[in-house]
Amino acid sequence: SAPGEDEECGRVRDFVAKLANNTHQHVFDDARGSVSLSWVGDSTGVILVLTTFHVPLVIMTFGQSKLYRSEDYGKNFKDITDLINNTFIRTEFGMAIGPENSGKVVLTAEVSGGSRGGRIFRSSDFAKNFVQTDLPFHPLTQMMYSPQNSDYLLALSTENGLWVSKNFGGKWEEIHKAVCLAKWGSDNTIFFTTYANGSCKADLGALELWRTSDLGKSFKTIGVKIYSFGLGGRFLFASVMADKDTTRRIHVSTDQGDTWSMAQLPSVGQEQFYSILAANDDMVFMHVDEPGDTGFGTIFTSDDRGIVYSKSLDRHLYTTTGGETDFTNVTSLRGVYITSVLSEDNSIQTMITFDQGGRWTHLRKPENSECDATAKNKNECSLHIHASYSISQKLNVPMAPLSEPNAVGIVIAHGSVGDAISVMVPDVYISDDGGYSWTKMLEGPHYYTILDSGGIIVAIEHSSRPINVIKFSTDEGQCWQTYTFTRDPIYFTGLASEPGARSMNISIWGFTESFLTSQWVSYTIDFKDILERNCEEKDYTIWLAHSTDPEDYEDGCILGYKEQFLRLRKSSVCQNGRDYVVTKQPSICLCSLEDFLCDFGYYRPENDSKCVEQPELKGHDLEFCLYGREEHLTTNGYRKIPGDKCQGGVNPVREVKDLKKKCTSNFLSPEKQNSKSN
């Protein structure tokens, strides 16, 4: 069983009184509809809450919304609906919050049917004041901020126009018509696809990919026969229709679309899809769907150019219907990802990789758990994690797995222990070492969140009944205290804490229901008095990440280096604080063959770390050879894994082979590109 409140747990002294003094209730004086909450800026304490309520009238629905603002992390709220002239705000566009600490907010309003365009409310002072602006178009999407300059906005209109503003939405200019999809790239570049004939849907596979680097003054067509495109890390991907048939292939650019290379990935047919699961500046995880409605595909990992791909995981669960995948980046430890596979017997199993997709294994069985009914052998089984797929299947899973970069090693997730994911009610499990080992943390499903960079974990039981109890732990989930935050239980709807897990405040949202009325209510609890002192040097201990065998000279080496972290001791009850920075010390490892992937035209025989030349090129390897760029076909068979920092040790030097004799051109060749100016 999970540890609880017993004599073995170190109790936090006088916590009830400390928390009672720091619990703030706010009752919202509107009827229950929907509520959305956004944090404005980082460490500002500013929260915007939008409540919307639809009143069904005879012919139409009348919408009413209210806007509230807090500047103390949710302890107090002020009704600021008058700042937006009591206008109804369209919740499907959410609240568009500017990047970083720009303090910018855009709200999209509902306007009456016959109007020429939409309406937005803009704030650039953390929602203290709003300016109403009428748009010359009806927006189809939320306003998108340029990551580099929060004054630059783009939006698509309902008539497929691409609109840009250079002065934070004050003035708008339509820079292109017939646009299907638009995205900001780096350096204020905009990428977008256009159709020529009928519509986005009709022209799918015949779209053009365009780029503008000067907000619409000039354009360059950087791709034709485009099905779709995506950005990931420093890579620009385009899914391009093949000349001869209805298949399509991925092409990659690392220079904003000036030059393209075909990716050494299988082509896909009409019913299949590609999906970028994760990408950074080093590499990309790409899912390639299997033919037929199988619900699974294959994960491939790229080299540093995004061109050569290694098969990483077979039978990767990714449903075509709901588009659900459990693929999760464990942000609390470098190189760790968790996902699900669909096994031959159609059961779903969880897999984990600690080395960025190099090897996948099952999750180790938690020490304090028994194998469930799905296990053939009651002594041997694994932990299986519930993520997006389980949530989409309406299993009793209120939350996806949680990890935070500044709460090193901590992963919290719902799961079951057996041979596969179980439909039984799950429990909550925690890992403090990035997924190597797990412990049952809480019995039954819960909502959970991490505060103060891991110094506090907060949880609330998932229940259909009203609740009034919150649980918290100051030792990474080993021991739990319960606090009754209100005498009158509420119907719980969500936990809210400032993104980044640095805050010590948690807001509990819900509603009260009486005979005639129903009202939104929030309780904000500040844990600052529980962690009454700042952490000192003595509160931290040294931890080596990815350690599996101390007797191995290279213990802890992942992608060519090991990292030691200062971690808060479980017994220390103190504040990491808002300015906490993870202290880590890397040390470079010696290279082994495992630090290299096999380049194009080479493969690793099973249980061998050497790369061997493929006797003949078949399937998509042959296509890559035929259509690949010449310089990518000269190789010694090895290529360092992206992000690998190893030095010395094994250096697989051998004769360079040239495969370019067989090769011609490529679908996205420069001669098929052109430039235009407005």
Partner: antibody, heavy 124, light 106 residues
């Protein structure tokens, strides 16, 4: 089999310093923390501090902070403990010990290998 | 720093006796406790780590239990070789040892 071999006995004058060495053989020295523990005649054990050879991360008991320096040389698999401003109360047997390790935590699993001890006598 | 209080400080027992030594931490240390045996003129020897895990090569008559603040070392049937001084040691704060328990012949 891992062994820790310490340097020989020392006799020191009050106010001076002593540097004791601890050489590891037969194991992966770099992957374990080395602690220094002392025992005055007829007394109990007292932890002075420890070091992790990779990166040279040292930490010290508050009592010895500023007076003790622990270092490690990965190339020779040797750890050193230097104690300065010696006084008669520092007369003791000084042990180096390897911190056992089952996970990434260096100090949590007890000291599984000990040196033979070095007697340091402080006398005028 | 975390204080460790060991009791009793001296314990008289006979061969075959069941012996129990307790150790109390001034604050919770989870399971991060080790037990050592030391004989005169010798270095300490690790018996138990993580409160209850037996170090390899240590006879199974030694066992440890407890977590949080209360811990126990038990020798199920005292052998002639077991007369020695025993120390507990916490590892969750800066390392500290208990004062020791001397097990002597009754």
């Amino acid at each position: 089999q891992v062994q820790l071999v310490q340097s020989g006995a020392e006799v020191k004058k009050p106010g001076s310093s002593v540097k004791v060495s601890c050489k590891a053989s037969g194991g992966t020295f770099r992957n374990y923390a080395i602690s220094w523990v002392r025992q005055a005649p007829g007394q109990g054990l007292e932890w002075m501090g420890g070091i992790i050879p990779i990166g040279g991360w040292a930490n010290y008991a508050q009592k010895f902070q500023g007076r003790v320096t622990i270092t490690a040389d990965e190339s020779t698999s040797t750890a050193y403990m230097e104690l300065s401003s010696l006084r008669s109360e520092d007369t003791a047997v000084y042990y180096c010990a390897r911190q056992g390790r089952k996970t990434g935590y260096y100090y949590y699993y007890g000291m599984d290998v000990w040196g033979q001890g070095t007697t340091v006598t402080v006398s005028s | 720093d975390i204080q460790m209080t060991q009791s009793p400080s001296t314990l008289s027992a006979s061969v075959g006796d069941r012996v129990t030594i307790t150790c109390r931490a001034s604050q919770s240390i989870s399971s991060w406790l080790a037990w050592y045996q030391q004989k005169p003129g010798k270095a300490p020897k690790l018996l138990i780590y993580k409160a209850s895990s037996l170090e390899s090569g240590v006879p199974s008559r030694f066992s440890g239990s407890g977590s949080g603040t209360e811990f126990t070392l038990t020798i199920s049937s005292l052998q002639p070789d077991d007369f020695a001084t025993y120390y507990c040691q916490q590892a969750d704060g800066h390392i500290t040892f208990g004062g020791g328990t001397k097990v002597e012949i009754k």
